[in-house]
């Protein structure tokens, strides 16, 4: 039981982070216009991968996308390409790790492909994650360079008579969802992993074991409900010895002192 | 046809109050940014206060603290509640819409404030 | 605050003549977000409310005849009126969109000569 809940958790988990990794990846606020110590502007200045945008005070939004590829600056074209590659390989995962979950039951598969599965999954999850983290930590520390080197010369101009205001850009509520977003795809491709281990079944090569509880004797030959789902409280799914009844679950999870005799 | 019609203008004595109100049809006020621009007799235009969505109001420094700009939704009207007057005061009010640029397009036919004793 | 000089303050020009009216900011009006400049033109008759002609510097506001005309960038803007006519004697007003509070030039009274 504790295998499938770990497993249903890290599949929701993930699919929440890449629900998050997709959002961040198209939202236009990765960047923003800093508000803090500039003069009050009318304009609200933001960017994000695709195209930037200006909110004037009247309401009126307008955006631009950034038409060109070759013209945008290589830190750019490098978050672009992990948060892609990191949205391609959670959503392969997540296609991977529905067929893994023990809960679907698809043909006669062997709880040692749904651990493969699972193990795949959750790597992918983990790589997704990962990509994500490192895509938005790039346009952070690319932001606050630039930043840094915009307060220096925050103003520009001849001999002072003429200034210019130079727009500064600051952490956009994009990025924040990245993180939130990478860390969740990460943290769920953990969870995936874990249940793999829980998933993989026992490797005890032995035919028949004899049992002598309670006065009966009972022949047991193990692994013959491999294709079970889990699901439900089908009684011939349940293995009964030693007086008490276990799911196949707690079977694989916890061995009986039996299983060592 | 959008219009804009102010009024509450009138005579105050310095230190006085007054509540201006501009009325709008053809527009929904709501959903646009709006502003009070005043002109003293025979003088330029001055920009006196704006507020724009979410409430967020902007005010001339002369008049930030004394004047507040608001609006009521369900009667379409704009209001600028103005206290502690000044002879400087006394000028022409107009409400206007902003529109794309920032810009005024739609102006009221202004209601005429005099500041006197 | 921005402060905008218009120049001349007062201009007199022959009907069918070539009027133009100039705007010079203290700051930069130019918003490097979407290349545009907050800049608008307004023409004020007496007796009436001011009346919108250009924004962002150089868009004309539908209605407003194609013989005026804005252009400019940065801190140095024109209002041009290519064939003056009659019913253009006002006074015009620059304004600064861009930065709050949100200043008008002192105008410039337009006559016929």
């Known amino acids: 039981m504790a295998v499938t809940a770990c497993q249903g958790l890290g599949f929701v988990v993930s699919l929440i982070g890449i629900a998050g990794i997709i959002a961040a990846t198209c939202m236009d606020q990765w960047s923003t216009q800093d508000l803090y110590n500039n003069p009050v502007t009318a304009v609200f200045n933001y960017q994000g991968l695709w195209r930037s945008c200006v909110r004037e005070s009247s309401g009126f939004t307008e955006c631009r996308g950034y038409f060109t590829l070759l013209g945008l600056p290589a830190m750019l074209q490098a978050v672009r390409a992990l948060m892609i590659v990191g949205i391609v390989l959670g959503a392969i995962g997540l296609l991977v790790s529905i067929f893994a979950l023990k809960c679907i039951r698809i043909g006669s598969m062997e709880d040692s492909a749904k651990a493969n599965m699972t193990l795949t999954s959750g790597i992918m999850f983990i790589v997704s994650g990962l990509c994500a983290i490192a895509g938005v930590s790039v346009f952070a520390n690319m932001l606050v360079t630039n930043f840094w080197m915009s307060t220096a010369n925050m103003y520009t101009g001849m001999g002072g008579m003429v200034q210019t205001v130079q727009t500064r850009y600051t952490f956009g509520a994009a990025l924040f969802v990245g993180w939130v977003a990478g860390g969740l795809t990460l943290i769920g491709g953990v969870m995936m992993c874990i249940a793999c281990r829980g998933l993989a079944p026992e490797e005890t090569n032995y035919k028949a074991v004899s049992y002598h509880a309670s006065g009966h004797s009972v022949a047991y030959k193990p692994g013959g409900f491999k294709a079970s789902t889990g699901f439900g409280s089908n009684t011939k799914n349940k293995k009964i010895y030693d007086g008490g009844a276990r799911t196949e679950d707690e079977v694989q999870s916890y061995p009986s002192k039996h299983d060592y005799v | 046809e959008v219009q804009l019609v102010e009024s509450g203008g009138g005579l105050v004595q310095p230190g006085g109050s007054l509540r201006l109100s501009c009325a709008a049809s053809?527009?929904?006020?709501?959903?646009?940014?709006m502003s009070w621009v005043r002109q003293a007799p025979g003088k330029g235009l001055e920009w006196v206060s704006s507020i724009i969505s979410g409430g967020i109001t902007y005010y001339l420094d002369s008049v930030k603290g004394r004047f507040t700009i608001s609006r009521d939704n369900a009667k379409n009207s704009l209001y600028l509640q103005m206290n502690s007057l000044r002879a400087e005061d006394t000028a022409v009010y107009y409400c206007a819409r902003k529109y794309h640029g920032n810009a005024l397009d739609y102006w009221g036919q202004g209601t005429l404030v005099t500041v006197s004793s | 605050d921005i402060v905008m000089t218009q120049s001349p303050d007062s201009l007199a020009v022959s009907l069918g003549e070539r009027a133009t009216i100039n705007c010079k900011s203290s700051q930069s009006l130019l918003n490097s977000g979407n290349q545009r400049n907050y800049l608008t033109w307004y023409q004020q008759k007496p007796g009436q409310p001011p009346k919108l002609l250009i924004y962002?510097?150089?868009t004309r506001e539908s209605g407003v005849p194609d013989r005026f005309s804005g252009s400019g960038s940065g801190t140095d803007f024109t209002l041009t009126i290519s064939s003056l006519q009659a019913e253009d004697v006002a006074v015009y007003y620059c304004?600064?969109?861009?930065?709050?509070?949100?200043?008008f030039g002192q105008g410039t009274k337009l006559e016929i000569k």
């Open positions: 962002w510097a150089s």
């Open positions: 304004q600064n969109n861009y930065f709050y509070p949100l200043t």
């Open positions: 053809g527009i929904t006020l709501s959903t646009y940014a």
